[in-house]
Amino acid sequence: DTHKSEVAHRFKDLGEEHFKGLVLVAFSQYLQQCPFEEHVKLVNEVTEFAKTCVADESAENCDKSLHTLFGDKLCTVATLRETYGEMADCCAKQEPERNECFLQHKDDNPNLPPLVRPEVDVMCTAFHDNEATFLKKYLYEVARRHPYFYAPELLFFAARYKAAFAECCQAADKAACLLPKLDELRDEGKASSAKQRLKCASLQKFGDRAFKAWAVARLSQKFPKAEFAEVSKLVTDLTKVHTECCHGDLLECADDRADLAKYMCENQDSISSKLKECCDKPLLEKSHCLAEVENDEMPADLPSLAADYVESKDVCKNYAEAKDVFLGMFLYEYARRHPDYSVMLLLRLAKAYEATLEKCCAAADPHECYAKVFDEFQPLVEEPQNLVKQNCELFEQLGEYKFQNALLVRYTKKVPQVSTPTLVEVSRNLGKVGAKCCKLPEAKRMPCAEDYLSVVLNRLCVLHEKTPVSEKVTKCCTESLVNRRPCFSALELDEAYVPKAFNAETFTFHADMCTLSEKEKQVKKQTALVELVKHKPKATKEQLKGVMDNFAAFVEKCCKADDKEACFAEEGPKFVAASQAALA
């Protein structure tokens, strides 16, 4: 399906509004430090050019690829070398190497200030004064901080952002209406970004076979009534969509995602009974709804898997004829029967099944060799079940903050070389698994917990790749995507680690602590806890709990004092001395 002008094709398919939004997202994700105005200028230039191509597809340069057009435009930025350093060298390359070069320079942890939320009246005024600029600014600010954000989904977030302001800026109590909506968008946005980052890591680090396996398992859980051929078609299309978005081909990605939504809604009967509600919605909402749709009910009469995959004498013949298709069918059949398993567990089972067939199909008596293959699954299933059971027990015992602290101690002991801000961020997010998953019924706990942990641990892997400091982290992150979480779970205390020297400055606190929000206070205390474990990695949990209780009491006391700063100056050194004695 070739077009004389790719840019004209995408402009016509997507429409001007989505075209401009996606180009802005693409540019912001590549050049994360550029000012907003610069990006708007580039987007307007590209849009004007696209319109000339729509008018005449044979016009000059209209036949160029989108990478060539966009790359040429990015390379016109005057301050490229000063702002981005070696990224400027990408501009000396030809396509497709130039785009690959830009992709490699995407920064998962850009040095950008945290977004501060202005007063509600200030935001409403800005929204009313120039709605278009206000929404573009949202796309820009999110995209530059989240360079792998799923672009068509970001357009959906922007539409919700717009709707929130349109509604709440008219409300009697603007803040009461708007702030919860903005909090929800922020939290959902961070979660969406992290989930997409795992998809991109899966494609880029482990290849499309890994992503397709993930998609087969997930879609088979969602659509257990669909035939294998139908699931395979959806997997192929979904893989194309995510490959494009992760590769920076945002216009193609959004266009293909719209096509996939259209296909799913036209073929609901052979996919799932749960799609109907989604399919009545407008495009962005429809695609989001389809992606989040609940699992359909399992067919009532599914036969045992053993007949085709263990008892049959043709297992090795069927496997040899088309290995990936046979394994794909096994994964599909297992996943549609097990919505109670995490996708990662299902992939481990498929991997174990594959390893058994590789070994047994070369043996003297293959059937005898693989007869007990399903028994070998038991420990693989029990491991995440135990993990969820134990950690939910601890979460219920401690509550979220103290559960996060337990994870901070656990992960600092495992990988003490990792930077303190990364350990705090990752452990706080790991700790959120409790509130998110532990309240769910038993059948939903494992898929919720383990698949969420995979997303959070991917963030650790992505940050660590930028600045590698631990061989253990590198090993867990790179050896196997599906075994990342069990690899981290199995890590023991790092005996080779040389404890960090005591630095009084790290444990010096001031009166400004008292004016911090509850979340900021927690982060300060958790930062100190990580530093404490790095200084005393063999401290027991009871010792650390005692120190943290004393710390909370010390801060509370000084924040209640008349002269807060004097209290911190006097009580701080006493607290540090008492803590050192307790941990000696």
Epitope: L394, K413, S489, E492, L493, T540, K541, E542
Partner: nanobody, 124 residues
Framework: QVQLVESGGGLVQPGGSLRLSCAAS????????MGWFRQPPGKEREFVAS????????YYADSVKGRFTISRDNAKNTGYLQMSSLKPEDTAVYYC?????????????????WGRGTQVTVSS
């Protein structure tokens, strides 16, 4: 401080049985989970089994499942490891450990207190 003392180790033939005990003194034993770990000669210490504070959840290493049983008697401040169908590869120093969370984790660093160990040798 919790003090833990293991007993019951010794020399046993393959296929035989042993019962290890772990006597605790100090704070209330019933608030701690208990774990058994072992260190085979020339190898790392490894998880064997654990039991939570109330005794209603038990966990086992795959290598001992079906052969070993962990239990506890909170009234006696004692934990037990019943080992049967012993194999030469079970030869190790066995350690008892207490976990203040009361959960019974698989990782050794989660345990706050440790006994000195008791030798188990399985040989004909």
């Amino acid at each position: 401080q919790v003090q833990l003392v293991e007993s019951g180790g010794g020399l046993v033939q393959p296929g035989g049985s042993l019962r290890l005990s772990c006597a605790a003194s100090g704070p209330i034993f019933s608030t701690y989970a208990m774990g058994w770990f072992r260190q085979p000669p020339g190898k790392e210490r490894e998880f064997v089994a654990s039991i939570n504070r109330s005794g209603d959840s038990t966990y086992y290493a795959d290598s001992v499942k079906g052969r070993f049983t962990i239990s506890r008697d909170n009234a006696k401040n004692t934990g037990y490891l019943q080992m049967s169908s012993l194999k030469p590869e079970d030869t190790a120093v066995y350690y008892c450990a207490a976990d203040s969370d009361g959960i019974g984790w698989f990782n050794s660093f989660e345990y706050d207190y440790w006994g000195r160990g008791t030798q188990v040798t399985v040989s004909s």
